[in-house]
């Protein structure tokens, strides 16, 4: 005998389906027969393969009870049926969506729904003629009404709503409606009245108007000087580009999609043209000055500055500077010269009255007191005085009075007031020229003379001998002069050229070792005796490693 399929159960219920699960019976069989009842009383039968352990009944009606029988079959034999009874889920009912005006810029929604555990309601509001303008709102599931503010005046809207219950959406309900017509404008006022601009303020209900249209008339000529349209969200606008000391009529209209309100007007007189003031000169130097002035913080286009020598009206220079500036540096002036400086502002094509002031530049910076000291056969020291903080550099030129030597030029930092001049021949007369250099000036040159001392005769070393020559070293010996010397300087260099090497030894020594030589190279060696600043004539010789 065939045994009954085991543990038939409903594992999942939905509005239009039931999911069945069961276990296979022990006895061998060919197939299953599944029968279920419809709400009409009819039975529907389905044949299933023997390896089936689950089945979904689809296309059922929501909120209905179904009887299910499952039988195992072999040939003409049938098992006893396994039975289960289950109901599909109710479709939560969401009904009676009504939309009423909530003022001219909003809507009130009401709906009815079963008191099921709705999680949320999702609402969409969009202009009937513009699906791009959709706004979504999600509200708690316990609500049955919602206010939708901030909509356009006198506009058709489509409102849609669905509920979310047990994590699933209900069908959508929709309705069409329109917002109310526009209310009137409030009042219009002016603020921050300047000489060329003012601020217009007004009141109006939020969201009522698409735009505002503003007209500005000059009262005396009744000419329209400005027409402008501003967005409906604004309640204030700046009106620039007006004339100073002029009476204006300003008219405001609210504009919706299809009509304009009655106009509101206001009359206003602009301020007088502003004045420049407080012209002063600071930081007067020998070649320039800084001009300062004050004015109201208005939109000056630019300022025009004129600088002219008081005694030479031909020599005038003009410069134009941005309207944001309140100071300007005027360079390139003459030292110790009286000047007249004038300025006027340009604002909206108007010139302010001119302001002037008189000023004199400082005296030109100077250098002087060029002195020579510490003279030796080969060098001397120079010192001089100069105006502090002016000079970038000093130029020193040294010329021998016989014009036999090349002119030597030295550039010294502007902070220095001394210089050591060396490498000169003894017993020679020199002329020294000094000039100071600043960014826009080179001073007059000052000069002095200097004569290097005579060289006292000093005996040279004698008889250079090379001994103990190896690949990379050699000993050099000499005979000292009769007069006592402080030191000997030995210079050696490959005869083919290169960097000379130098060794200085005590004046009591008569030989030294030359090291770090290059194998197989001929070296030229020169030895001089030294005492103080004096040097002897050299004695030379050569050797090969």
């Amino acid at each position: 005998e065939l045994d009954t399929p085991k543990d038939l159960q409903v594992s999942e219920t939905a509005e239009t389906s039931l999911t069945l699960l069961w276990k296979t019976p022990l006895a061998k069989f060919d197939r299953y027969r599944l029968n279920y009842s419809l709400p009409t009383g009819q039975w529907v039968g389905v044949q299933l393969p023997r390896n089936t352990t689950s089945y979904v009944l689809r296309g059922l009606e929501p909120g209905q009870e179904y009887n299910v029988l499952l039988t195992a079959e072999k040939g003409r034999h049938k098992s006893k049926p396994a039975r289960v009874k289950a109901s599909t889920e109710e479709v939560p009912s969401l009904e009676n969506l009504t939309v009423t005006e909530a003022g001219w810029d909003g809507l009130r929604l009401n709906w009815t729904a079963d008191d099921l555990a709705y999680e949320y309601f999702v609402i969409q509001v969009q202009e009937a003629n513009n699906v791009e303008t959709a706004h979504n709102f999600t509200v708690p599931g316990n609500l049955r009404a919602a206010d939708i503010p901030g909509l356009k005046v006198a506009t058709s809207y489509r409102v849609s709503i669905y509920g979310v219950a047990r994590g699933y959406r209900t069908p959508v309900l929709s309705a069409e409606t329109s917002t109310g017509t526009t209310p009137n404008l409030g009042e219009v006022t002016v603020a921050e009245v300047g000489w060329d601009a003012l601020t217009l303020n007004w009141t109006a209900p939020e969201g009522a108007y698409k735009n505002f249209f503003i007209q500005v008339l000059e009262a005396d000529t009744t000419q329209t000087v400005q027409n402008l349209t501003v967005p409906g969200g604004l309640r204030s606008v700046d009106l620039p580009g007006l004339k100073a000391a002029t009476r204006y009529y300003i008219t405001l209209r609210g504009v919706t999609q299809d009509f304009g309100t009655a106009p509101l007007s206001v009359e206003v007189l602009t301020e007088d043209l502003p004045q420049l003031g407080g012209l002063s000169v600071t930081e007067v130097s020998w070649d320039g000055l800084t001009l300062n002035w004050t004015t109201d913080d208005l939109a000056y286009k630019h300022f025009v500055v004129q600088v002219q020598e008081a005694n030479n009206v031909e020599a005038a220079q003009n410069l134009t500077v941005p309207g944001s500036l309140r100071a300007v540096d005027i360079p390139g002036l003459k030292a110790d010269t009286p000047y007249r400086v004038s300025i006027y502002g340009v604002i909206q094509g108007y010139r302010t009255p001119m302001l002037s002031t008189d000023v004199s530049t400082a005296r030109e910076p100077e250098i002087g007191n060029l002195n020579v000291s510490d003279v030796t056969p080969k060098s001397f020291n120079l010192s001089w005085t100069a105006t502090d903080g002016i000079f970038d550099m000093f130029t020193i030129e040294i010329i021998d009075s016989n014009r036999l030597l090349q002119t030597a030029e030295h550039n010294i930092s502007g902070a220095e007031r001394t210089a050591h001049i060396s490498g000169l021949p003894p017993s020679t007369d020199f002329i020294v020229y000094l000039s100071g250099i600043a960014p826009s000036i080179r001073t007059k040159t000052i000069s002095t003379t200097a004569t290097t001392e005579a060289l006292t005769a000093m005996g040279s070393p004698k008889e250079v001998i090379f001994s103990d020559i190896t690949e990379n070293s050699a000993t050099v010996s000499w005979r000292a002069p009769t007069a006592q010397v402080e030191s000997f300087r030995i210079t050696y260099v490959p005869i083919t050229g290169g960097t000379p090497s130098m060794v200085t030894v005590d004046g009591t020594k008569t030989q030294t070792r030359l090291v770090k030589l290059i194998p197989g190279v001929e070296y030229l060696v020169s030895i001089i005796a030294m005492k103080g600043f004096e040097e002897s004539e050299p004695v030379s010789g050569s050797f090969t490693t």
């Epitope: 239009t16 949320y120 969409q124 979504n136 709102f137 999600t138 959406r169």
Partner: antibody
């Protein structure tokens, strides 16, 4: 125009967790639904779950229940998806997306690559 | 969870062809269905929502139909830009739901 900007790529060890952020700009963040969708290399799209920031309650796909946590911070307009007990098969590009009224995902983030490797 | 089955998984077609992709839900989802297009390395793009509503900016050659458990996406005249993978998604689940396994439309 809504824009969704996601945090950068992550490399994680098996067993660890990853938290991906999604910052929204444009539109009213709290009133729309944010969903998280992933796509493993060469595979299809998988919806993981979603949240309505205004309520802070999240719904998850059965497959990810217990392993994924979706949250939202209304003050910064940022949604977060945290996936725990990572395994190599969680290697995927994770997207956040905004749902429209009908549930269609009309705006998407640029995607965040999460690699799970020992 | 509601299961979504898409067919075919791959579809070879030529420019100008009329292409139809089918999506079947494991239970009735009314018209809560969306279709997406995805190109390699890019995020999906919404084409159709509410089974038949065309998303703003999507060419009119794309259309959707169906309700309950059977749905189709039709491309009336395939363009070079349309070679991509297409996914259906049920939205009966809130806030969103399961995707089909995808249909790759490739050049014949």
């Amino acid at each position: 125009q809504v824009q969704l900007v996601q945090s950068g790529a992550e490399v994680k060890k098996p067993g660890s967790s990853v938290k991906v952020s999604c910052k929204a700009s444009g539109g009213t963040f709290s009133s729309y639904a944010i969903s998280w969708v992933r796509q493993a290399p060469g595979q299809g799209l998988e919806w993981m779950g979603g949240i309505i920031p205004i309520f802070g309650t999240a719904n998850y796909a059965q497959k990810f229940q217990g392993r994924v946590t979706i949250t939202a911070d209304k003050s910064t307009s940022t949604a977060y998806m945290e996936l725990s007990s990572l395994r190599s098969e969680d290697t995927a590009v994770y997207y956040c997306a905004k749902g429209n009224f009908y549930g269609g995902l009309d705006y998407w983030g640029q995607g965040t690559t999460v690699t799970v490797s020992s | 969870d509601i299961q979504m089955t898409q067919s075919p998984s791959t579809l070879s077609a030529s420019v100008g062809d009329r292409v139809t992709i089918t999506c079947r839900a494991s239970q009735s989802i009314s018209s809560w269905l969306a279709w997406y297009q995805q190109k390699p390395g890019k995020a999906p793009k919404l084409l159709i929502y509410d089974a038949s509503s065309l998303e703003s900016g999507v060419p009119s050659r794309f259309s959707g139909s169906g309700s309950g458990t059977e749905f189709t996406l039709t491309i009336s005249s395939l363009q070079p830009d349309d070679f991509a993978t297409y996914y259906c998604q049920q939205n009966k689940k809130f806030p969103s739901g399961t995707f089909g396994q995808g249909t790759k439309v490739e050049i014949k």
